[in-house]
C-alpha cells in the first residue's frame, strides 16, 4: 500500500508505523460526541485509546475514518483546542488545518495518502502538537439504540440516519440480525429477536425493512437490508433483548411481589446473594416492579440455580442495573443464600388480620438463628420449595 | 407521637409462663414491623423477636426459639410475647421496640417491663 | 451471625474531651450501623442512624463515621448529661446483633 509522506512534525526517529492489511478495519473510534458518528478521533494503541493528533488531520483523514465507521463521507474536519483558556477558540466546524509552533510530543498521528481507510497508518508518538484533538462529524451520522425496554440493551431497535431516530421492521427479523445490534452496543449477544408489540411502538421513520444480517456485521447498517419505506407499520417494530439486559421476578411467594429474587441475566435465571442483600437494594427492587417499597428482607432458602449476581444501591436508583452490580460466575453466593423480599404491594400484606394467637401456621428452620413462619395457605407453600 | 407502653411482666418460678403486651399508638402500627428487645440487669441489649408487619414473617435467636412466640393483633395495635419455659437467664427489661420502615432499625422504644423468673 | 465488638467497655473523661467509641463488624455491613444512648433506668435512645446520620433532637455534639466494617460514634465536646451506656447495633443482617456497650462516666 502506498504510504504517506511524513509531514514535517512528523517525529519519525521514535515513530513505529502499522499499515493495515486489506480486510481489516481502521482501529479508531469517535468519542464525547452526538453519535457514534460524529466526535472526537482516538486511535487504538496496543492496550489503550488515544486521542489522534489535531496538528496533523486532515479532509482525507476524515473521510477515511467516517468510511471505516460505516458512517458515509466525512460533513466536517475540525480540531478541538486543548482545555486551557489562553488558546484561541477552535476553528468552525469544516474548517481543517494544521497547528503551528507546535510544543508537545506523544499524539499518535493518522495519516492517509487518500479518503480510503486502506490507505491510512498510525504512527505512535509522532505527533509534535499544541494539544488539539482531531474531531469528525460524519455525513450519515448514524447511531444505534434500544428503547422501551428498560434498560441500554433491550427494546425497540432504533437507528439514527439524516438526523432522524427511526425503526426497523421486523420482516426477516432473527437472532442473528440481533445479535448484530446487541454487539454493536456492547450489550453481550442477543437472546431474543423479537417482533413487533414486544414493545411499545416507535413513531418516527421505518430507516429499514428485510434487514439480513450474517451476525458478522460490526455495524446493522452494513447488513443487506431494504429501505423501509411503504411496507411496514409500526406495530412491526423490531426489538432485540440482549445477554447484558437484567430484567428481575420474585418467585416462591403469594404474588409477583413477593418471594426470591432472581435476575435474568446472559440467558439464564440466576440466584441474587443475599449477603449482600440490604434495605437499600430491596427497595429499589420492589419500585422497578411496580411493587411499592420493600417492607421485609426474609432470610433466603437454599436454591439451585445458576448465577451469582451481587448488588450494592444507594437506594435512589431506578433499576437495580443502575446500582453497582457484579456477577460471580463461579461462585453461587460464596456461603450465603438466595436473597428474597417482600413487597409493600404483595397481597399478603393486605387482609391479614393476624390473630393474637395464630391459627394454622407452618414453621420452618432456615437457619440456626432464624425461624419463618409462614401462614398454611396454599398460595404460600410454594415459599418453601 | 410515637408511643409503645409494655406491661405483663412480674415474678415468675423457673419452667412457668408469662404473657407481655405491648400497646402502641401515634403511628400506623399495621405498617411495621415490630420487636422485642430485653437486657438482663447490669447486662447489655439483646435482641429477642421480630414479626413483620402483616405477621407473615417471623424470627428468633437461638437462646429463645421454642419457648417465646411473637405475635401481633393490627386491630388492637398490640404487639404480644408468649413467654414459657422460662429460666432465670430470663431475667430481664423487656422492650417493646417498632422496626424502622426503610432502614430497619429500632426507632422507638418503649420504657420496658421487668420479667424476673426465680423461685 | 454477624458479631459487633465494641470498644472500650468504660470511659471515665472530663466535661470539654472529645471522645470515640468504636464498634467493628464481623463483616461489611454497608453502613447499616445505629447508635443508642441509655440512662440508667431508661429505655435506649436512638443518637444516630445509618452510620453518620443525626437522629431528631439530638444534639450536633454527637456524630457518627465510618463503613464497611469499622464505624464510631464521637461526642466532640462532652457535657455531664452524657453519661450514659452507649450501644451500637447492626441492622444490615437479620439476626440484628448490638455491640456489648460502652459505660461513660464523666470525671
Known amino acids: 500500500h502506498p504510504s504517506p509522506a511524513p509531514p514535517d512534525q512528523l517525529n519519525t526517529s521514535s515513530a513505529e508505523s502499522e499499515l493495515w492489511e486489506p480486510g481489516e478495519r481502521l482501529p479508531v473510534r469517535l468519542t464525547n460526541g452526538s453519535s457514534s458518528c460524529s466526535g472526537t478521533v482516538e486511535v487504538r494503541l496496543e492496550a489503550s485509546w488515544e486521542p489522534a493528533c489535531g496538528a496533523l488531520w486532515d479532509s482525507r483523514a476524515a473521510e477515511a475514518v467516517c468510511r471505516a465507521l460505516g458512517c458515509g463521507g466525512a460533513e466536517a474536519a475540525s480540531q478541538l483546542a486543548p482545555p486551557t483558556p489562553e488558546l484561541p477558540p477552535p476553528p468552525a466546524a469544516g474548517n481543517t488545518s494544521v497547528a503551528a509552533n507546535a510544543t508537545l510530543a506523544g499524539a499518535p498521528a493518522l495519516l492517509c495518502s487518500g479518503a480510503e481507510w486502506r490507505l491510512c497508518e498510525v504512527v505512535e508518538h509522532a505527533c509534535r502538537s499544541d494539544g488539539r484533538r482531531a474531531r469528525v462529524t460524519c455525513a450519515e451520522n448514524r447511531a444505534l439504540r434500544l428503547v422501551d425496554g428498560g434498560g441500554a440493551c433491550a427494546g425497540r431497535v432504533e437507528m439514527l440516519e439524516h438526523g432522524e431516530w427511526g425503526s426497523v421492521c421486523d420482516d426477516t427479523w432473527d437472532l442473528e440480525d440481533a445479535h448484530v445490534v446487541c454487539r454493536q452496543l456492547g450489550c453481550g449477544w442477543a437472546v431474543q429477536a423479537l417482533p413487533g408489540l414486544h414493545f411499545t411502538p416507535g413513531r418516527g421513520p421505518i430507516h429499514r425493512d428485510q434487514v439480513n444480517c450474517s451476525g458478522a456485521e460490526a455495524y446493522l447498517w452494513d447488513c443487506p437490508g431494504l429501505p423501509g419505506q411503504h411496507y411496514c407499520g409500526h406495530k412491526e417494530d423490531a426489538g432485540a433483548v440482549c445477554s447484558e439486559h437484567q430484567s428481575w421476578r420474585l418467585t416462591g411467594g403469594a404474588d409477583r411481589c413477593e418471594g426470591q429474587v432472581e435476575v435474568h441475566f446472559r440467558g439464564v435465571w440466576n440466584t441474587v446473594c443475599d449477603s449482600e442483600w440490604y434495605p437499600s437494594e430491596a427497595k429499589v427492587l420492589c419500585q422497578s416492579l411496580g411493587c411499592g417499597t420493600a417492607v421485609e428482607r426474609p432470610k433466603g432458602l437454599p436454591h439451585s440455580l445458576s448465577g451469582r449476581m451481587y448488588y450494592s444501591c444507594n437506594g435512589e436508583e431506578l433499576t437495580l442495573s443502575n446500582c453497582s452490580w457484579r456477577f460471580n460466575n463461579s461462585n453461587l453466593c460464596s456461603q450465603s443464600l438466595a436473597a428474597r423480599v417482600l413487597c409493600s404491594a404483595s397481597r399478603s400484606l393486605h387482609n391479614l388480620s393476624t390473630p393474637e394467637v395464630p391459627a394454622s401456621v407452618q414453621t420452618v428452620t432456615i437457619e440456626s438463628s432464624v425461624t419463618v413462619k409462614i401462614e398454611n395457605k396454599e398460595s404460600r407453600e410454594l415459599m418453601l420449595l | 407521637e410515637v408511643q409503645l407502653v409494655e406491661s405483663g411482666g412480674g415474678l415468675v418460678k423457673p419452667g412457668g409462663s408469662l404473657k407481655l403486651s405491648c400497646a402502641a399508638s401515634g403511628f400506623k402500627f399495621s405498617r411495621y414491623a415490630m420487636s422485642w428487645v430485653r437486657q438482663a440487669p447490669g447486662k447489655g441489649l439483646e435482641w429477642v423477636a421480630t414479626i413483620s408487619s402483616g405477621g407473615s414473617y417471623i424470627y428468633y435467636p437461638d437462646s429463645v426459639k421454642g419457648r417465646f412466640t411473637i405475635s401481633r393483633d393490627n386491630v388492637k395495635n398490640t404487639l404480644y410475647l408468649q413467654m414459657s419455659s422460662l429460666r432465670s437467664e430470663d431475667t430481664a427489661m423487656y422492650y417493646c421496640?417498632?422496626?424502622?420502615?426503610?432502614?430497619?432499625?429500632?426507632?422507638?422504644w418503649g420504657q420496658g417491663t421487668l420479667v424476673t423468673v426465680s423461685s | 451471625d454477624i458479631q459487633m465488638t465494641q470498644s472500650p467497655s468504660s470511659l471515665s473523661a472530663s466535661v470539654g474531651d472529645r471522645v470515640t467509641i468504636t464498634c467493628k463488624a464481623s463483616r461489611d455491613i454497608r453502613s447499616y450501623l445505629t447508635w443508642y444512648q441509655q440512662k440508667p433506668g431508661k429505655a435506649p435512645k436512638t443518637l444516630i442512624y445509618?452510620?453518620?446520620s443525626l437522629a431528631d433532637g439530638v444534639p450536633s455534639r454527637f456524630s457518627g463515621s465510618g463503613s464497611g466494617q469499622d464505624y464510631s460514634l464521637t461526642i466532640s465536646s462532652l457535657e455531664s448529661d452524657d453519661t450514659a451506656t452507649y450501644y451500637c447495633l447492626q441492622h444490615g443482617e437479620s439476626p440484628f446483633t448490638f455491640g456489648s456497650g460502652t459505660k461513660m462516666e464523666i470525671k
Open positions: 445509618y452510620a453518620t
Open positions: 421496640a417498632r422496626r424502622d420502615y426503610d432502614l430497619d432499625y429500632f426507632d422507638s
